[in-house]
């Protein structure tokens, strides 16, 4: 028997520095977690103690903090090289800055293989990119070899900016021939490493003949055996065992997100490459693990540029951006409109001639808007200003919901109206009319939504049975502010870009902004 230790991360989302327990900015260092310096300490400790170790990343290193905004992926290559990752799968967010934003900072600089079997380059891009990532890589480990085959969510064209010259194929269809290739090369220990979410990870384990282990990402799934060490609630045991169609027991793992945990899986193979046993657990990277001094020093050196960036002008406003709770928790506010417009703009993807865009709607809890921006400071807007408006380090995500769920969400928005509560929704691509004289749960009297399958966008009444795409904060997707119906009834959820980054990019693009209050949210006469 031969034992392999798989260390794995996924959805790190530019958390290079240690964070608080909820993966936001570290405030009290003695209670902070994660970060590459701490990760390096644990990885090195395991490498010294165990003979056959692989360090793998299942994608979405890109996007999530000011680190990515400023360094645009160079920080990912630099620190992943420093940690000596053995392989990485491409995630959807690796395409956020287009293909060029992947090629130059990461693909050309990484000293480890970057993998995806289901992304096929065509046209002029083929010669430029296809040698820079691979479908699989055979890695010598100790006296054996292990094949790693990569995959990426086929939804990436709807979630990011891969352009028109990359085709995202079905994961299972694309993986099978690559695994077969590895089999022709007599590689009999094969790990599928990828970024399509836990449901697809399980399907790959079930359907792709020859895959021994699946290491996944995208869905931020937390698996744990025993008593979990922090706030995350396990979605199942670690590893999650799937019985494949050909009768094998295939371990599937994921390690939550944001570098808070290091996945730790021990696999025992027999001499024919069959998995005999698998066990492990994610390791919580808390303050009991010291930060490596040399990596920490490097982080501090890179940090300097971030502090300078925070105070630079992104663009100008010529109007007061009303982000006060007195406005945004009671009525349509222009800060809410600005943020929603930025959220939609960030999700412009012309992937189908029938649609002007794949999504037209935005909802945003008014309680998530934490500050106004005064235009009387020469109109200047900085990252620092936006960090006061959106201080929680969240993301603006894409969900699919039935019309009936949206209707419930808008009823919840005003179910206790008047108490300055955070659930009051700001909107984009939606016209809503409330009648507050009616009883809670029956106050939405009109709800029109902007069409997507149209050449000239116009507002049509919401259909209860239709499925709609909506951009919203991850806080709402996770049922925050009492929006349990969203969490319980959503049909799909893909995590998006960092909230501040979305708004800052929009402001930089527009240069000068003047959002208005324009009748997106109305109250019927006599009720307000």
């Amino acid at each position: 028997a031969w034992e392999l230790t798989i260390l794995h991360t996924n959805d790190v989302h530019s958390r290079l520095e240690q964070t608080s327990e909820d993966s936001s900015k570290c405030v009290n260092a003695s209670r902070c977690m994660g970060g590459v310096a701490r990760l390096f300490t644990k990885v090195q400790q395991i490498r010294r103690a165990e003979p056959n170790v692989l360090l793998l990343d299942a994608g979405d290193q890109y996007q999530g903090t000011i680190w990515f905004t400023v360094y645009k992926g160079a920080e990912v290559a630099h620190f992943m090289n420093a940690l000596r990752y053995d392989a990485m799968a491409l995630g959807n967010h690796e395409f956020d800055n287009g293909v060029e934003g992947l090629i130059e900072p990461l693909l050309k600089e990484a000293k480890f293989p970057i993998l995806s079997a289901n992304i096929k380059a065509k046209g002029p891009l083929a010669s430029q990119i296809s040698g820079l990532y691979l479908p699989y890589k055979v890695l010598p480990v100790g006296d054996e070899v292990v094949g790693i085959v990569g995959y990426t969510s086929k939804e990436t064209p709807f979630l990011s900016n891969p352009g028109t010259n990359l085709v995202f194929e079905d994961e299972i269809t694309a993986l099978q021939p690559e695994v077969d290739k590895l089999k022709t090369l007599n590689v009999n220990k094969i790990i599928a490493l990828g970024h399509s979410g836990f449901e697809m990870d399980k399907l790959i384990a079930q359907k792709v003949r020859g895959v021994d282990v699946v290491v996944g990402g995208h869905s931020n799934t937390f698996l744990y055996t025993g008593n979990p060490p922090s706030k995350e609630v396990p979605a199942g045991k670690y590893p999650f065992i799937v019985t494949s169609d050909d009768g094998r027991k295939v371990p599937v793992v994921q390690a939550y997100a944001f570098g808070k945990y290091l996945g730790y899986l021990k696999i025992e193979f027999d001499e024919r490459g069959n998995v005999i046993s698998s066990h492990g657990n994610p390791i919580l990277l808390n303050s009991s693990i010291p930060e490596d001094p040399s990596i920490k020093a490097d982080i501090n050196k890179w940090r300097i540029k971030l502090d300078n960036y925070s105070t630079q002008e992104l663009g100008k406003t010529i109007v007061y951006l009303d982000g006060s709770s007195q406005s945004c928790r009671f009525r349509e506010c222009n800060m809410g409109n600005l943020i929603c417009d930025a959220m939609i703009n960030n999700n412009l993807r012309h992937t189908d001639e029938m649609f002007w865009n794949h999504v037209s709607m935005c909802i945003l809890n008014g309680g998530g808007i934490r500050s106004p921006i005064d235009e009387r400071n020469n109109g200047t807007i900085t990252w620092e200003n936006l960090a006061a408006v959106l201080p929680f380090g969240g993301t603006f995500d894409l969900v699919q919901l039935k019309g009936s769920t949206l209707k419930k969400a808008f009823e919840h928005s005003v179910h206790r109206y008047g108490q300055s509560t955070g659930e009051f929704l700001q909107v984009g691509g939606i016209h809503v009319v409330y009648d507050l004289s009616r009883k809670p749960g029956d106050r939405v009297v009109k709800l029109d939504v902007l069409c997507t399958k149209c050449r000239v966008p116009s507002y049509d009444p919401l259909k209860m049975d239709e499925v709609y795409k909506v951009i919203l904060p991850n806080f709402l997707a996770n049922g925050g502010d009492g929006f349990q119906m969203i969490k319980d009834e959503l049909l799909r959820h893909d995590s998006g870009d960092q909230d501040i980054n979305v708004v800052s990019t929009y402001i930089s693009k527009m240069k000068v902004i003047y959002p208005a209050v324009e009748g997106r949210i109305k109250f019927s006469t006599g009720s307000h």
């Epitope: 040698g131 055979v138 054996e144």
Partner: antibody, heavy 117, light 107 residues
Amino acid sequence: DIQLQESGPGLVKPSQSLSLTCSVTGYSITSRYYWNWIRQFPGNKLEWMGYITYDDNNNYNPSLKNRISITRDTSKNQFFLKLNSVTPEDTATYYCARGGWDPFLYWGQGTLVTVSA
Amino acid sequence: DIQMTQSPASLSASVGETVTITCRASDNIYSYLAWYQQKQGKSLQLLVDSAKNLGEGVPSRFSGSGSGTQFYLKINSLQPEDFGVYYCQHYYGTPFTFGGGTKLELK
């Protein structure tokens, strides 16, 4: 330093079997890599014949499948080629090499085998 | 099987010149491609792996490029020791196949 050395008869009669030995020094053939036979015909054309892996599995070129066998003796750190039913078309310089899923980094110096009556 | 086609079959050049050899694969092989040099009466020496990575001790005047189905080996400022036969080879699954070779001769 890793070295590979081919040995065997330089002349084989048609219809007989060709047998060659590759002796490896500086690296154990049970460690990690694949151990290949490659031949080069008089016109310089190269053909990969097959390999034996560190864990004793074989992979042969389909064009030779019914005639070829690659085995090993781990105690001597050697691996062997046997090619049955040879014809004059099998006249070539035979090389052993280390590689497999990656390119052939280490080669023997080659041994010329002529198939002739 | 994946066929590897090399061009030109032979090439005459002078010391100091720059030459490029092309290798075409019959199917997409990503960057699972190697280049070798063979001198008269000797075995092959690995020059480039993964289409572009120079082997250890290989002079920087050699460079590999390309991916998918089209690959190139470029030799800048030819030196007397560069003359010989060059081969490409894919290792994207088995059977591994070689190009027919390009004989680089002194003009």
